[in-house]
Interface confidence: low
């Protein structure tokens, strides 16, 4: 296959109600016209998918009904929001950029953002 | 067993149409780039027409460009392709191919896997 | 399109003889080269990627080598099961395109 920069922040902290987004961007050697977006987490030398959504360029990505992540794109950057995060999910988070067509195939595999999780604090009871 | 098995091949006028499938088994059709590669007779090799696995992008070669329709059916695990207006320089065996496509952090681009092909005669 | 030109367009050795044939790309296509085995009345078989990965399952007899726009295929010790013809095909600029052939016959 054919080696594609994929370049994404380095760290990002996901908000007190587990929300965490980021930029994933991709220097296209071609003009694809459907692309393939993958969230890999990486944690404790295990890889394992988070979620992925193919996309015609210049259409929204779609991906499935039950999946955490959303996202949008524009141009050869895709803005990705993972949900529903938790202390125990903190972990490198790797955007992988598939070129799915026309031939060739093209790949590129970011360096991965280290995304920290806090669960918040559990807010007192309260007297009314 | 990973195989491909193309039917609709035949003998048919100029100007006639026809209508090849390739029926796939054992792997994940849907995940997979095809192609069809012709293959005339004492001749070589040509790619004719690809589609993505979504079948949402498709690409032909200039020599069947408005005539050849491929399209794919991921329900039913079967690749097409829709042939009009043949001409006599159509007349070839006509394969199926796979492009390799497997969703791991290393990846390739080749056809790995061909069927058996079908032989289209435009003749008359 | 890049043309891919493979010579000799046939050949005849004999058995155990070590048999050659190259392949031209009119541009630089890097490493992107495969290489195929089709046998008579049989479809193509894949058997070099990337110009010099031997895919799973083909004998070690069969390599391939080159950069650029200059490959080259070798069967180190020619068996009568390998008479067939051979393509090579690059992968670097759609459309894909493949050599002529070369039909490799035992002597």
């Known amino acids: 296959c054919k080696a594609m920069h994929v370049a994404q922040p380095a760290v990002v902290l996901a908000s007190s109600r587990g929300i965490a987004s980021f930029v994933c961007e991709y220097a296209s050697p071609g003009k694809a016209t459907e692309v393939r977006v993958t969230v890999l987490r990486q944690a404790d030398s295990q890889v394992t998918e988070v979620c992925a959504a193919t996309y015609m360029m210049g259409n929204e990505l779609t991906f499935l009904d039950d999946s955490i992540c959303t996202g949008t794109s524009s141009g050869n950057q895709v803005n990705l929001t993972i949900q529903g995060l938790r202390a125990m999910d903190t972990g490198l988070y790797i955007c992988k950029v598939e070129l799915m067509y026309p031939p060739p195939y093209y790949l590129g595999i970011g360096n991965g953002t280290q995304i920290y999780v806090i669960d918040p604090e559990p807010c007192p009871d309260s007297d009314f | 067993e990973v195989q491909l098995v193309e039917s609709g091949g035949g003998l048919v006028q100029p100007g006639g149409s026809l209508r090849l499938s390739c029926a796939a088994s054992g792997f994940t059709f849907s995940s997979y780039s095809m192609h069809w590669v012709r293959q005339a007779p004492g001749k070589g090799l040509e790619w004719v027409s690809g589609?993505?696995?979504?079948?949402?992008?498709?690409s032909y070669a200039d020599s069947v460009k408005g005539r050849f329709t491929i399209s794919r059916d991921n329900s039913k695990n079967t690749l097409y392709l829709q042939m009009n207006s043949l001409r006599a320089e159509d007349t070839a065996v006509y394969y199926c191919?796979?492009?390799?496509?497997?969703?791991?952090?290393?990846?390739?681009?080749?056809?790995?896997?061909w069927g058996q092909g079908t032989l289209v005669t435009v003749s008359s | 399109d890049i043309q891919m030109t493979q010579s000799p367009s046939s050949l005849s050795a004999s058995v155990g003889d070590r048999v050659t044939i190259t392949c031209q790309a009119s541009q630089d296509i890097s490493n992107y080269l495969n290489w195929y085995q089709q046998k008579p009345g049989k479809a193509p078989k894949l058997l070099i990627y990337?110009?010099?990965n031997l895919e799973t399952g083909v004998p070690s007899r069969f390599s391939g080598s080159g950069s650029g726009t200059d490959f080259t295929f070798t069967i180190s010790s020619l068996q009568p099961e390998d008479i067939a013809t051979y393509y090579c095909?690059?992968?670097?600029?759609?459309?894909?395109?493949f050599g002529q052939g070369t039909k490799v016959e035992i002597k």
């Open positions: 990337d110009a010099s």
């Open positions: 589609i993505s696995f979504s079948g949402r992008s498709t």
């Open positions: 095909q690059q992968g670097d600029a759609w459309p894909w395109t």
């Open positions: 191919a796979r492009y390799l496509m497997s969703f791991n952090l290393t990846r390739t681009s080749w056809f790995d896997v």
